[in-house]
């Protein structure tokens, strides 16, 4: 089990001519939100096919109103990551769809209307536990910059989140047949549920239900000690007549590695080194050919005409990795100081500074509370470069100048108007809606009075019928 995480860095006009019109206007302010859909494998399925690995919806971004005459800038983004939990193993290869949605906030009957601004899709290889991978995708005249990673949830570890780790019972070493869990060296790999009766001291398993023996032990449950005296062959079947037990077949005998993988014995088991285009414990996961389009970011695919031959991706400048999936990451040098977010724009590096810091590399610390007063009895709190007012009861906002507004969270549904009241809040519903917060349409079939379908609903159908 684990979590796929997506961080949107920017969404705005792409380079080149034909800048898109701003999606928001002074008459129709709007805000963005994002939807991500994940599917296992490298299949580029239709956008409507189920998101078998999971899907997530971001929070709504800040409200944006176009400044007349100004070019469309990068639009303000929602805070936080999009997180897609996955329950089973991380597949290693996956397809994604990222949609950018616009929520119009005009006074139209029925409340906010949703429309799809842009959709990007791609296919990637990604090992769980690795660093953030950065990406840029274009949809028409729009450009989306984002990073993503997959991480395992404890106790799972490994590139597929299939190995389990537990805290070490003994301080010095892991139990027999169990190795330390890199990078958590103070933890040990947890045993799988092996074949019933498999010796816990002398047996282990790589797959549930099997029983493999440590050196010096044999038998179906690894309970029989190996005696090498008076044994003729160094490795062969046990001899019931002489009582001589010899080690069973070695882990690499018969080469368990498929598709031309080479096998090497390890103290516990074996390890397969797979040829390019194959992966998995035994190189059993089928190869990818040039016909599958495995090279990303404009990489040129060479060879690999059939599944038995490898392909090679020749990457364009600025990209690397066996599938050109990695941007050459100049941000890995961490040029942004004081927790600033580094953006590699290709032509330049840019630092997005945390509140309270400024400068090309966020190197200037602004004196946050100097000359700043918090109104209405609030006190200024300085921390981590960010000025903050701790407001007295009943007040809010950056400087405590605003009365705490129960309507700030937009609690009325379907375009209902919120009014602050001494007892809390009151929603005045748009015609055709009822309920304390206008969440009940009186006649739901009157589609004209309802908002457009948000993500996850069939186009043109404002409700979901189950």
């Amino acid at each position: 089990a684990g979590v796929f995480e997506l961080q949107i860095h920017s969404f705005g006009p792409g380079p080149g001519p034909g800048a898109p019109r701003s999606p928001c206007s002074a008459r129709l302010p709007c805000r963005l939100f994002f939807r991500v859909c994940l599917k296992p494998g490298l299949s580029e399925e239709a956008a409507e096919s189920p998101c078998a690995l999971g899907a997530a919806l971001s929070a709504r971004g800040p409200v944006y109103t176009e400044q007349p005459g100004a070019p469309a800038p990068d639009l303000p983004l929602p805070d936080g990551l999009l997180q897609v939990p996955f329950r089973d193993a991380w597949p290693g290869t996956f397809s994604f769809i990222i949609e950018t949605w616009r929520e119009e906030l005009g006074d139209q009957i029925g409340g906010p209307a949703w429309s799809l601004l842009a959709r990007v899709a791609g296919r990637r290889r990604l090992a769980a536990g690795g660093p953030w991978a950065r990406d840029i995708q274009r949809a028409g005249a729009w450009e989306l910059r984002f990073s993503y990673r997959a991480r395992c949830e404890p106790p799972a570890v490994g590139t597929a989140c299939t190995r389990l780790c537990r805290p070490r019972s003994a301080p010095s070493r892991c139990g027999p047949g169990l190795r330390p869990c890199a990078p958590l060296e103070d933890e040990c790999e947890a045993p799988l549920v092996c074949r019933a009766g498999c010796s816990p001291e002398h047996g282990f398993c790589e797959q549930p239900g099997e029983c493999r023996c440590l050196e010096g032990w044999t038998g179906p449950l690894c309970t029989v000690p190996v005696s090498t005296s008076s044994c003729l062959s160094p490795r062969g079947p046990s001899s019931a007549t002489t009582g001589c037990l010899v080690p069973g077949p070695g882990p690499c005998d018969g080469n368990p590695c498929a598709n031309g993988g080479s096998c090497s014995e390890t103290p516990r088991s074996f390890e397969c080194t797979c040829p390019r285009g194959f992966y998995g414990l035994r190189c059993e996961v089928s190869g990818v050919t040039c016909a599958d389009g495995p090279c990303f970011n404009g990489g040129l695919c060479v060879g690999g005409a059939d599944p038995d031959s490898a392909y090679i991706c020749h990457c364009p400048p600025g990209f690397q990795g066996s599938n050109c999936e990695k941007r050459v990451d100049r941000c890995s040098l961490q040029p942004c100081r004081n927790g600033g977010l580094c953006l590699d724009l290709g032509h330049a590096l840019r630092c997005r500074c945390r509140a309270g810091f400024a400068g090309p590399r966020c190197e200037h610390d602004l004196d946050d509370c100097a000359g700043r007063a918090c109104a209405n009895g609030g006190t200024c709190v300085e921390g981590g470069g960010a000025h903050r007012c701790s407001c007295a009861l009943g007040f809010g906002g950056r400087d405590c100048r605003e009365r705490a507004d129960p309507c700030a969270a937009r609690p009325c549904a379907h375009g209902g108007r919120c009014y602050a009241h001494f007892s809390g809040l009151v929603c005045a519903c748009a015609p055709g809606y009822m309920g304390a917060r206008c969440e009940f349409p009186v006649h739901p079939d009157g589609a004209s009075a309802l908002p457009a379908a948000p993500p996850g609903l069939r186009p043109g159908d404002p409700q979901r019928y189950l």
């Epitope: 739901p444 948000p454 404002p462 979901r464």
Partner: nanobody, 117 residues
């Protein structure tokens, strides 16, 4: 994804009572506003009664005093107690959920209530 399954519909005589149940899965009922709608043959679907996530209730005039909506968050269910039933209450009754976290609405498949002597 919220799934809603209604039960409790059937044939009842005028003046009789019936209780409809709706079991929700896929989301905690405490995070949902829930309602009962009905659709009589040849008519538009209409709201009957609703209960917000804070417990406040709403009814259409024609059922006030006769129908009661309630919820049991522990059982992830919403109920409609219908008393003094009339022939004009005959309809397919649908369970409805409004999920606040993403403003999505969900519907059940419906259960038929027939009031006839």
């Amino acid at each position: 994804e919220v799934q809603l399954v209604e039960s409790g519909g059937g044939l009842v005589q005028p003046g009789g009572s019936l209780t409809l149940s709706c079991a929700a899965s896929g989301s905690a009922v405490s995070m949902l506003s829930l309602a009962w709608y009905r659709q009589a043959p040849g008519k538009k679907r209409e709201l009957v009664a609703g209960i917000s996530d804070d417990g406040s209730q709403v009814y259409i005039d024609s059922v006030k005093g006769r129908f009661t909506i309630s919820r049991d968050n522990a059982k992830n269910s919403v109920y409609l107690q219908m008393n003094s039933l009339r022939a004009e209450d005959t309809a397919v009754y649908y369970c409805y959920a409004y999920r606040w976290e993403d403003a999505l609405t969900y519907w059940g498949q419906g259960t038929l209530v027939t009031v006839s002597s």
